[in-house]
């Protein structure tokens, strides 16, 4: 058992058929040494009496809040939340894997630029009942400060029969160092409570991998004089980590007709404009990744040919 | 060339040859769901890579004052990683082609740092650690967790040289 | 795109010499190994050995060598691998491949092969 | 020489069962392994590379596990279209080497 905050425990547990489960002593916090009875949740029932409770901790009727009372009056709370560990592994019922990059990815994170600042999203079909706390750090060992927000729900999807609820966090490492080369990894913790449920999260990454800059922007066309070529020319997004000579994009550009059958042309180029064939109900789009190391692409701006 | 102590390098032939590197070291490991190195068994394999600090003076401003420390601790990690490549964690078992982009990787490595330092003149390099697995698993492991570092290092590199062929260069 | 297209069919007498080619498109032929596999009927697979037309420079299986010369020709990008005393044994299909760039020995593009028989 | 050892030789599944083909190699090759698939009269197509790294464009129900001398080519359910020769191959020792193939029908 361990505190995960004033007056909120958490009770490992091996879940099994016939699992003994786990012996807990819960003390009041009063200096009243008799006349002390403890309840559970709203029951009136009284499960014991004495400054402590001890109680054998094996499932979901277990857990809950326990009050200690004397005469009427509360005394102090403890609420119990159960972690199951099923054939050595903890459970993760309450976030969806995402199955990208790969299985059991629970925690996806990004970053616009090099700033220090990131975003984490996750998944879960659970409408109530739901909190979430995240902390982050620098390494593990000898942790440095990154700040996370309050996760908050961004974003509601109908998936078939199930609504899907989307969470997502924001953090900012303390002391970032955008031009050095990183050698320790963030990491990242979701403590995730489904009504008397506990579970935990982690993702660890280097801010160079999560890196996906916002589409370029102020796409243009400027037809050339006499021919079925555009020169097609953008700007850096806002977003992206400054001076552009140091923190440089590459991009691609692609023309790509009305059908998705239809052939597309691709051009890379680290330049912010190029030439290219604009063919009748085509679209030209851009998209931009960091010049010198394959994060992911950005998403694409677009516009017609027309 | 960059010779030690004063004059500057040659921003531009030094911009082209990083970011050649760049582009190998994603060839010679691209980005692909066989493994999380980091999950990997992390012990004592790539931990004493020269990494580009903060404090280095490789940040655009670091570079505007004083670019030698920064390029002294580029050469650092190019003469570093060129002797890992040219290792036997490279040679061994699992077998690499001769077309394997980390022959290309490891005469690109040297001849940056031949840009940087001239002939005659030393900066301190650093020892690097008596690694010679035996299995094949563990030297691909390493191998994976060097590349996965060399390009970090050679991302920040790139970076550096770009900006001073642009800003520095005379 | 990359393709790799081999010379026909043959029939050949016991102790006699063949000479199978591989032409290369859509990629630049000095800069990749050019693998040889063969495959008798109802077989595995059987590494041969490759050519790395940049410098010429073959490696063959132990297992062939005496029997196989692999050659390359930048000039056409074609690579040829010549088997020599002809045995019964020899009668398989004959593949060219091409690995992955990342310079491990997967083979990603293969030629369509060609079946040599070895018959008196 | 590594020699790899696959079986079974020959497996029949109905359409929608989970396949499951072995292949034992007689040294540690780490993760050097690739499974190919070969349909009647074609050419092998890559599958797997490095033990379980799909190649682009190959369904997912076709998967890899295993490292040093154990590997696996699984099909989570399979498909009429997958009925083929199946081989492993490791490529981290010469001579590279391949499994005697495994040849897959449906019942």
């Known amino acids: 058992i361990w505190e995960l905050k004033k007056d909120v425990y958490v009770v490992e547990l091996d879940w099994y058929p016939d699992a003994p489960g786990e012996m807990v002593v819960l003390t009041c916090d009063t200096p009243e040494e008799d006349g002390i009875t403890w309840t559970l949740d709203q029951s009136s029932e009284v499960l014991g009496s004495g400054k402590t409770l001890t109680i054998q901790v094996k499932e979901f009727g277990d857990a809950g809040q326990y009050t200690c009372h004397k005469g009427g009056e509360v005394l102090s709370h403890s609420l119990l939340l159960l972690h199951k560990k099923e054939d050595g592994i903890w459970s993760t019922d309450i976030l969806k894997d995402q199955k990208e990059p790969k299985n059991k990815t629970f925690l996806r994170c990004e970053a616009k630029n090099y700033s220090g600042r990131f975003t984490c999203w996750w998944l879960t079909t659970i409408s109530t009942d739901l909190t979430f706390s995240v902390k982050s750090s620098r390494g593990s060992s000898d942790p440095q400060g990154v700040t996370c927000g309050a996760a908050t729900l961004s974003a509601e999807r109908v998936r078939g029969d199930n609504k899907e609820y989307e969470y997502s966090v924001e953090c900012q490492e303390d002391s970032a160092c955008p031009a050095a080369e990183e050698s320790l990894p963030i990491e990242v913790m979701v403590d995730a409570v489904h009504k008397l449920k506990y579970e935990n999260y982690t993702s660890s990454f280097f801010i160079r991998d999560i890196i996906k800059p916002d589409p370029p922007k102020n796409l243009q066309l400027k037809p050339l004089k006499n021919s079925r070529q555009v020169e097609v020319s953008w700007e850096y997004p806002d977003t992206w980590s400054t001076p552009h000579s140091y923190f440089s994009l590459t991009f691609c550009v692609q023309v790509q007709g009305k059908s998705k059958r239809e052939k597309k042309d691709r051009v890379f180029t680290d330049k912010t404009s190029a030439t290219v064939i604009c063919r009748k109900n085509a679209s030209i789009s851009v998209r931009a990744q960091d010049r010198y190391y394959s994060s992911s692409w950005s998403e694409w701006a677009s516009v017609p040919c027309s | 060339r960059a010779v030690p102590g004063g004059s500057s390098p040659a921003w531009t032939q030094c911009q082209q040859l990083s970011q050649k590197l760049c582009t190998l070291a994603w060839s010679a490991h691209p980005l692909v769901g066989h493994m999380d190195l980091r999950e990997e068994g992390d012990e004592e394999t790539t931990n004493d890579v020269p990494h580009i600090q903060c404090g280095d003076g490789c940040d655009p401003q670091g570079l505007r004052d004083n670019s030698q420390f920064c390029l002294q601790r580029i050469h650092q990690g190019l003469i570093f990683y060129e002797k890992l490549l040219g290792s036997d964690i490279f040679t061994g078992e699992p077998s690499l082609l001769p077309d394997s982009p980390v022959g290309q990787l490891h005469a690109s490595l040297l001849g940056l740092s031949q840009l940087l330092q001239p002939e005659g003149h030393h900066w301190e390099t650093q020892q690097i650690p008596s690694l010679s697995p035996s299995q094949p698993w563990q030297r691909l492991l390493l191998r994976f967790k060097i590349l996965r570092s060399l390009q970090a290092f050679v991302a920040v590199a790139a970076r550096v040289f770009a900006h001073g062929a642009a800003t520095l260069s005379p | 795109q990359v393709q790799l297209v081999q010379s026909g069919a043959e029939v050949k007498k016991p102790g006699s010499s063949v000479k199978v080619s591989c032409k290369a498109s859509?990629?630049?032929?000095?800069?990749?190994?050019i693998h040889w596999m063969r495959q008798a009927p109802g077989q595995g697979l059987e590494w041969i050995g490759y050519?790395?037309?940049?410098?010429?420079?073959?490696k063959y299986n132990e297992n062939f060598k005496g029997k196989v010369t692999i050659t390359a020709d930048k000039s056409t990008s074609t690579a040829y691998m010549e088997l020599s005393s002809l045995r019964s044994e020899d009668t398989a299909v004959y593949y060219c491949?091409?690995?992955?760039?990342?310079?491990?020995?997967?083979?990603?593009?293969w030629g369509q092969g060609t079946l040599v028989t070895v018959s008196s | 020489d590594i020699q790899m050892t696959q079986s079974p030789s020959s497996l029949s599944a109905s359409v929608g069962d989970r396949v499951t083909i072995t292949c034992k190699a007689s040294?540690?090759?780490?993760?050097?392994v690739a499974w190919y698939q070969q349909k009647p009269g074609k050419v092998p197509k890559l599958l797997i590379y490095?033990?379980?790294t799909r190649h682009t464009g190959v369904p997912s129900r076709f998967s890899g596990s295993g490292s040093r001398t154990d590997f696996t080519l699984t099909i989570s359910s399979l498909q009429p279209e997958d009925v083929a020769d199946y081989f492993c191959?490791?490529?981290?020792?010469?001579?590279?080497?391949f499994g005697s193939g495994t040849k897959l029908e449906i019942k």
């Open positions: 040294r540690d090759v780490a993760i050097a």
């Open positions: 191959h490791q490529y981290s020792s010469y001579p590279f080497t």
């Open positions: 490095w033990a379980s």
């Open positions: 491949a091409i690995p992955d760039r990342s310079g491990y020995a997967w083979f990603i593009y």
């Open positions: 050519i790395y037309p940049r410098d010429d420079s073959p």
């Open positions: 859509g990629y630049t032929f000095t800069g990749q190994t």
